[in-house]
């Protein structure tokens, strides 16, 4: 039975040319993390592997950072970055559980992080 | 030493399927990316797109969502492609290739090819 | 998605010459650029990524250079087994794409 939650930094919005942390968190669950998928729709942005650490998507890897921890740093950021962005742990032995970031890249300096918020 | 193995040709009818194998040996299959490439006379090489064999994450070509679908087998270390609703546009030599996970985005070893014929 | 060209698809030359493959791309790809080497078997073969590294058992007659858009393959001392079909490939962002080809025979 899959008993953990993904805590997220949920809706977030930064400005246009600056950079962002993607942070989840998974817990109540004893699960082992095996790997975390950073993604964007079905695109690939970079995985964290236990055993072999990370990998970066070539079409990012000039302007993602790995960590902090399990997170992702997205810099160099565009309006085209706006949209969807989940994080999938791979987890043994509950298996895959999936959390839910919207980013908002905004024009002007009126960037708020938004509430944090859960994904059972 | 390193070796990818595939399946030998096959010749299908139209809207069946077929699933490819390549078989790893001569190193560890987790920490290596497995490519798929299709080469049709006339249009050069195609990426299909990857899996990672220790976790399953697979990575497709836009243009081949929904025609490929990449397996692993870690037991075996062995990668399938399976080709979908087969058509005499995917008569082609397919061939799979290693990529080694971390920030190397290189083919350094290659199958020897598997030839598909698609005809009534 | 990114577009690579080898404008020449086919060349000749004899044992001995220096030979140069060219290869350009549809935007500046910033030296994330791989050639292959195709046998007429088939076999297929890396032999230099980033631009100019050479993969580990490939002979020094061959290098790359290049930058923005431009990029190419020096085979400096033609041998016979040089006989094949060389691809670029970029690596820039996804999806990976590759040149056409250019196939070289000896004279």
């Known amino acids: 039975m899959m008993t953990g939650t993904i805590e997220t930094t949920g809706n977030i919005s930064a400005e246009k040319g600056g950079s962002i942390i993607l942070q989840c968190h998974l817990s109540s669950t004893t699960a082992q993390v095996t790997q975390v998928n950073w993604e964007q729709q079905d695109q690939l942005l970079a995985i964290c592997n236990a055993d072999l650490g990370w990998h970066i998507s070539p079409s990012f890897k000039d302007r993602v950072a790995p960590g902090p921890g399990l997170g992702l740093t997205l810099q160099s950021l565009t309006v085209n970055d706006t949209g969807e962005y989940f994080c999938i742990y791979h987890t043994y032995p509950d298996g895959t559980y999936t959390g839910r970031i919207f980013l908002e890249v905004l024009e002007s300096s009126v960037a708020e992080h938004g509430a944090r918020f859960q994904i059972p | 030493q390193v070796q990818l193995q595939q399946s030998g040709g096959e010749v299908m009818k139209p809207g069946a399927s077929v699933k490819i194998s390549c078989k790893a040996t001569?190193?560890?299959?987790?920490?290596?990316?497995i490519e798929w490439v299709k080469q049709r006379p006339g249009h050069g090489l195609e990426w299909i797109g990857e899996?990672?064999?220790?976790?399953?994450?697979?990575y497709y070509n836009e243009k081949f969502r929904g025609k490929a679908t990449f397996t692993a087998d870690k037991s075996s270390n062995t990668a399938y492609m399976q080709l979908s609703s087969l058509t005499s546009d995917d008569s082609a030599v397919y061939y799979c290739?290693?990529?080694?996970?971390?920030?190397?985005?290189?083919?350094?070893?290659w199958g020897q090819g598997t030839t598909l014929t698609v005809s009534s | 998605d990114i577009q690579m060209t080898q404008t020449t698809s086919s060349l000749s030359a004899s044992l001995g010459d220096r030979v140069t493959i060219s290869c350009s791309a549809s935007?500046?790809?910033?030296?994330?650029l791989n050639w292959y080497q195709q046998k007429p078997d088939g076999t297929v073969t890396l032999l230099i990524y980033?631009?100019?590294s050479l993969h580990s058992g490939v002979p020094s007659r061959f290098s790359g250079s290049g930058s923005g858009t431009d990029y190419s393959l020096t085979i400096s001392n033609l041998e016979p087994e040089d006989i094949a079909t060389y691809f670029c490939?970029?690596?820039?962002?996804?999806?990976?794409?590759f040149g056409g080809g250019t196939k070289l025979e000896i004279k």
């Open positions: 290739a290693r990529q080694k996970y971390g920030n190397y985005y290189y083919f350094d070893y």
């Open positions: 001569g190193y560890t299959f987790s920490n290596y990316w």
């Open positions: 899996i990672l064999p220790g976790s399953g994450s697979a």
């Open positions: 935007q500046g790809i910033s030296n994330y």
């Open positions: 980033y631009t100019s």
């Open positions: 490939q970029h690596y820039s962002k996804l999806p990976y794409t």
